[in-house]
């Protein structure tokens, strides 16, 4: 239904706390360089204005669209051109072009320092002094670094953060209570960020139809007892929610997500038997819980997929009558039977099925042509299964750090032109798949591995898009989202690459490395490893292992030495010489 004042409607629906949080996220995702105080001031002004509209929907400007209201606020910021350059040109446009322009200027890799966590005492002090401001800082810092973070989900993580601080700041040993819990939230939030970015990429590059297909597959796996009409309704609603969030319409997105959660909880009987626990929770926890609810038990009496999609004489007729519905039904039926497959794989199978029907239904004898389609799925299924087995075996053998290094070598060989920081970030993230997925039961490994890798590779593509340097990467990133991971996996050593010349300073280290946290030490070592591969792309695994072991030994020795600086300055050049010899 239409509301006289959109802003009053959303304020009433969401409540002041969530309204303010979402407006803060929206502003922080659009203008990523502004300080918290600048954004907090804007948020307060917008909230005060919303309250006047709640009191009187006919008040001046209350009938304006949210894009108009928010855009006008952003465009009124002083020194916009000095701080944001050409983004200021967006302000010369009218809605909806102005909002589109803001979206295009979102930076997936803003030049902001890493979000450093203050030490426990300081954190607890500022949290106790003003919990609202403290959480506002959290929303601002995460949102500006992750301009596509799923806004209602970020509110959920802020709530988690709040609960952890409330609990741990009351403990004697705040540090040991906070660190593991906040690390856990950070890890989950980072995964949530890359997953959501993938959804927005899908929506931006391939439109709503592509996202809806993703949603149908995912929902059918989770709710195999729901009928096709129910799955279609949920997929349509979920597509709307994600379209809104990806488009910067965060108030509508959060409101519609709450509506969807309400609908699911009111219709559990036709959706899934596993929803009750989620539905007993308050809003943010409920929606989060529903988004990762366990798969319902599959119906026992499902007929073979071939009956309706291969053996039925009506296949081409049904396909002609309603292509999207027929393909949607195929995707639904196949997905509900295969919770053990990744969504990417299911979409590849649906694409193969569609291509087969396109070819076969045009022939004189279609059934003879499409009769073997299910057998033709086999190689498509085997490829990711082999990928999971090979990689999980390697992870179990090497551990997370060693596995990351193996991936780093592999990907530097595939795309040596890519910047070392990007390669290291990608390899570290790709390597985490082992810890995240390889410990799961067999039937959960494939969906976990492939869908996580796809999300990480999407980030690689986004970063590469900004400064394209590798034809290999461009080729894999240009295709459809579901083909990316197989494309990257199939890449081999880039034969066109001219090796980087050996620079001693790249491999020169100083005693300050000794005091770095373990994670930073690893990044330094992995940076050196990538540079080695760029120098010798065809170095054997054995050669690289020799050099890296020598490097680790050198660090260990010098960091234990009484005079660290002397050790680094004398042993360092020797290490460089040995490295050159080992790789000669």
């Amino acid at each position: 239904e239409a509301h006289k004042s959109e802003i009053a409607h959303r304020y009433n629906d969401l409540g002041e706390q969530h309204f303010k949080g979402l407006v803060l996220i929206a502003f922080s995702q659009y203008l990523q360089k502004c300080s918290y105080d600048e954004h907090a001031k804007l948020v307060q002004e917008v909230t005060d204005f919303a309250k006047t509209c709640v009191a009187d929907e006919s008040a001046a400007n209350c009938d304006k669209s949210l894009h108009t209201l928010f855009g006008d606020k952003l465009c009124a910021i002083p020194n916009l051109r000095e701080n944001y350059g050409e983004l200021a040109d967006c302000c010369t446009k009218q809605e909806p072009e102005r909002n589109e322009c803001f979206l295009q200027h979102k930076d997936d890799n803003p030049s902001l320092p890493p979000f450093e966590r203050p030490e426990a005492e300081a954190m607890c002090t500022s949290f106790k002094e003003n919990p609202t401001t403290f959480m506002g800082h959290y929303l601002h810092e995460v949102a500006r670094r992750h301009p596509y973070f799923y806004a209602p989900e970020l509110l959920y993580y802020a709530e988690q953060y709040n609960e952890i601080l409330t609990q741990c700041c009351a403990e004697a040993d705040k540090e040991s209570c906070l660190t593991p819990k906040l690390d856990g939230v950070k890890e989950k939030a980072l995964v949530s960020s890359v997953r959501q970015r993938m959804k927005c990429s899908s929506m931006q590059k391939f439109g709503e139809r592509a996202f809806k297909a993703w949603a149908v597959a995912r929902l059918s796996q989770t709710f195999p007892n729901a009928d096709f009409a129910e799955i279609t309704k949920l997929a349509t609603d979920l597509t709307k929610v994600n379209k809104e969030c990806c488009h910067g319409d965060l108030l509508e997105c959060a409101d519609d997500r709450a509506e969807l959660a309400k609908y699911m909880c009111e219709n559990q009987a036709t959706i899934s038997s596993k929803l009750q626990t989620c539905c007993d929770k308050p809003l943010l926890k409920k929606a989060h819980c529903l988004s990762e609810v366990e798969h319902d038990t599959m119906p026992a009496d499902l007929p073979a997929i071939a009956a309706d999609f291969v053996e039925d004489q009506e296949v081409c007729k049904n396909y002609a009558e309603a292509k999207d519905v027929f393909l949607g039904t195929f995707l639904y039926e196949y997905s509900r039977r295969h919770p053990d497959y990744s969504v990417s794989l299911l979409l590849r199978l649906a694409k193969k099925y569609e291509a087969t029907l396109e070819k076969c239904c045009a022939e004189a004898n279609p059934p003879a042509c499409y009769g073997t389609v299910l057998a033709e799925f086999q190689p498509l299924v085997e490829e990711p299964k082999n990928l999971v087995k090979t990689n999980c075996d390697l992870y179990e053998k090497l551990g997370e750090y060693g596995f990351q290094n193996a991936i780093l070598v592999r990907y530097t060989q595939k795309a040596p032109q890519v910047s070392t920081p990007t390669l290291v970030e990608a390899a570290r993230n790709l390597g985490r798949v082992g810890t995240k997925c390889c410990t799961l039961p067999e039937d959960q490994r494939l969906p976990c591995v492939e869908d996580y890798l796809s999300a990480i590779l999407n980030r690689v593509c986004l970063l590469h898009e900004k400064t394209p340097v590798s034809e290999h990467v461009t080729k894999c990133c240009s295709g459809s989202l579901v083909e990316r991971r197989p494309c990257f996996s199939a890449l081999t050593v880039d034969e066109t690459y001219v090796p980087k010349e050996f620079k001693a300073e790249t491999f020169t280290f100083h005693s300050d490395i000794c005091t770095l946290p373990e994670k930073e030490k690893q990044i330094k070592k992995q940076t050196a490893l990538a540079e080695l591969v760029k120098h010798k792309p065809k170095a054997t695994a054995e050669q690289l292992k020799t050099v890296m072991d020598d490097f680790a030994q050198f660090l260990d020795t010098c960091c234990k030495a009484a005079d660290k600086d002397t050790c680094f300055s004398t042993e360092g050049p020797n290490l460089v010489t040995r490295c050159k010899d080992a790789l000669a």
């Epitope: 004489q313 009506e314 007729k317 002609a320 396109e358 239904c361 045009a362 022939e363 004898n365 279609p366």
Partner: nanobody, 115 residues
């Protein structure tokens, strides 16, 4: 919505000819192979002939081979069945269908061969 409208049936004497037409709409005609099927009084559906989307490939049931010719005009989105040397056993309701479907989509057109 997919629509198939058959026409051209009638009463003919054995040995004579008829040309059936099927006007198609509501789908991408060139993307689909088309067939003619028939149902004699008191009998089940029987496949008669098929043609590929481009019109380059054709198939016939043994009972009509050499007498019937299937063709299509993709510009007019119309399917044809030229029936020569008709026999009494060709008497049936004739339907055009999409793909290899053995189903009645349209109303059909009645062909009666009798002396």
């Amino acid at each position: 919505d997919v629509q198939l409208v058959e026409s051209g049936g009638g009463v003919v004497q054995p040995g004579n000819s008829l040309r059936l037409s099927c006007a198609a709409s509501g789908f991408t005609f060139t993307s689909f192979g088309m067939s003619w099927v028939r149902q004699a009084p008191g009998k089940g559906l029987e496949w008669v002939s098929s043609i590929s989307g481009s019109g380059s490939d054709t198939l016939y049931a043994d009972s009509v081979k050499g007498r019937f010719t299937i063709s299509r005009d993709n510009a007019k989105t119309t399917l044809y069945l030229q029936m020569n040397s008709l026999r009494p056993e060709d008497t049936a309701l004739y339907y055009c269908t999409i793909g290899g479907s053995l189903s009645r989509s349209g109303q059909g057109t009645l062909v009666t061969v009798s002396s």
